[in-house]
């Protein structure tokens, strides 16, 4: 159910503060432009106002996509999707954002990693990820290598490995060589989700071969 409005919102925090406190898909506007994008807003978790930038839940969407697709976004905001690196980069360079990554395993457990500072560099700098201030239950060491790496896709190899991590492990991600995480890897169903190098990985919670059931990456202004 699309929640369109005449007002212009940069993120879900602005949507929330305008009085729209129901979960759903809202139209957001790029900072400093009139370009629009559809995003899912979580208005309930942890006080609401979260802009969902990634969701995996059922394997319905192929995440082995091109640089351009990761740049502009793909999938369905009501289900599995990637919001888009360009929008996230522009947004997180306007003010300070926090990033929360919520994870579910196949045994009914949930965990999260919360970074108090998050931004993506520009496309010119390959949407390099910058993170600081990790807390949460999904490991006290960051499963996204720090300092952050450039983003890589199957057609844009910017990792630190002589291999091509995105082709080998599938999906676009901030690969190191290749590093302890990839939330955009292959989706494996239950009982096929172990000993999978190319699955949905968050090493410092579940180890190297465990492919997760569900993931959500969400951002919100630090001063919300």
């Amino acid at each position: 159910d699309y929640k369109d409005d005449d007002d212009k919102f940069r993120d879900c925090a602005e949507v929330f503060k305008s009085g729209h406190t129901t979960n759903g898909i809202y139209t957001l506007t790029f900072p400093n432009s009139t370009e629009e994008i559809k995003a899912y807003c979580d208005m309930e978790a942890g006080g609401g106002g979260w802009t969902i930038i990634q969701r995996r839940e059922d394997g319905s969407v192929d995440f082995q996509r091109t640089w351009k697709e990761y740049k502009v976004g793909f999938g369905n905001p009501s289900g599995e999707y990637w919001l888009g690196n360009e929008f996230v980069s522009q947004l997180t360079n306007q003010q300070r954002y926090v990033l929360k990554i919520h994870l579910k395993d196949w045994e009914g457990n949930e965990a999260y990693s919360l970074y108090e500072h998050f931004y993506l560099s520009s496309e010119e700098l390959n949407y390099r990820i910058h993170l600081k201030g990790l807390t949460g239950t999904a490991g006290k060491i960051s499963s996204i290598s720090q300092p952050g790496n450039d983003f890589s896709t199957k057609d844009g190899d910017n990792d630190k490995c002589i291999c091509k991590c995105s082709q080998m492990l599938t999906g676009g991600w901030w690969f190191d060589a290749c590093g302890p995480s990839n939330l955009n890897g292959m989706y494996y169903p239950q009982r096929q989700n172990t000993n999978k190098a190319n699955g949905i990985k968050w090493y410092y919670w579940k180890g190297s071969g465990y492919s997760l059931k569900a993931t959500t990456m969400m951002i919100r202004p630090a001063d919300f």
């Epitope: 360079n93 300070r96 500072h117 931004y119 560099s121 520009s122 010119e124 700098l125 390099r128 910058h130 600081k132 201030g133 990790l134 807390t135 006290k140 060491i141 960051s142 720090q146 300092p147």
Partner: antibody, heavy 121, light 107 residues
């Protein structure tokens, strides 16, 4: 390769302003990261003074907040330190450095060679 | 501000020795701690970041560990060129603060 070079007067009189320039080569200061000033007192104690981020935002050490200003000239790829109302306690070697995070304090991976400043009449 | 208390102030060692320097934070710094080496007449050089990650090009004889309030820096086999002052720095909270330094002297 990224290089930083400090420049400015080596002697400043008490109550005057200290002004230093950091010239960066090999990387645009508007692309990413934060650009810091750190000083090292005689006896080797290091103190972070503040930074200007690639986006132009600044952050200062509260101990200096009333006296310090960090600005930049993007056309020359330079950033500047101004410290007002100096006293002999501001005598130190002043370094500029790049930190690995653009919106907050972080470790610093590239440093200038430092410039010695003496405050004396 | 987080106070970083670094010990010892002076280390007198022989080439080939293993040395350990500790830094204690007055409150949790998570793993946001870096270690620097400053050789005589030079500027500080980043060796370790995020408590345990070696910076590019740093020899593997340099290691770091720790989390929260207690951090350790070690040189497994000291070499003559390691003569320097070593500093810890926390960047978990602003302002970032440095330890007082440990001067490494070779016998």
């Amino acid at each position: 390769d990224v290089q930083l070079q400090e420049s400015g007067p080596g002697l400043v009189k008490p109550s005057q302003s200290l002004s230093l320039t950091c010239t960066v080569t090999g990387y645009s200061i508007t692309s990413d990261y934060a650009w810091n000033w750190i000083r090292q007192f005689p006896g080797n104690k290091l103190e972070w003074m503040g930074y200007i981020s690639y986006s132009g935002s600044t952050s200062y050490n509260p101990s200096l907040k009333s006296r310090i200003s960090i600005t930049r000239d993007t056309s020359k790829n330079q950033f500047f330190l101004q410290l007002n109302s100096v006293t002999p306690e501001d005598t130190a070697t002043y370094y500029c450095a790049r930190s690995t995070f653009g919106h907050y304090v972080s470790s610093m991976d590239y440093w200038g060679q430092g410039t010695s400043v003496t405050v004396s009449s | 501000s987080i106070v970083m208390t670094q010990t010892p102030k002076l280390l007198l060692v022989s080439a080939g020795d293993r040395v350990t320097i500790t830094c204690k934070a007055s409150q949790s710094a998570s793993n946001d701690v870096a270690w620097y080496q400053q050789k005589p007449g030079q500027s500080p050089k980043l060796l370790i970041y995020y408590a345990s990650n070696r910076y590019t090009g740093v020899p593997d004889r340099f290691t770091g560990s720790g989390y929260g309030t207690d951090f350790t820096f070690a040189i497994s086999t000291v070499q003559a060129e390691d003569l320097a002052i070593y500093f810890c720095q926390q960047d978990y909270s602003s302002p970032p603060t440095f330890g007082g330094g440990t001067k490494l002297e070779i016998k």
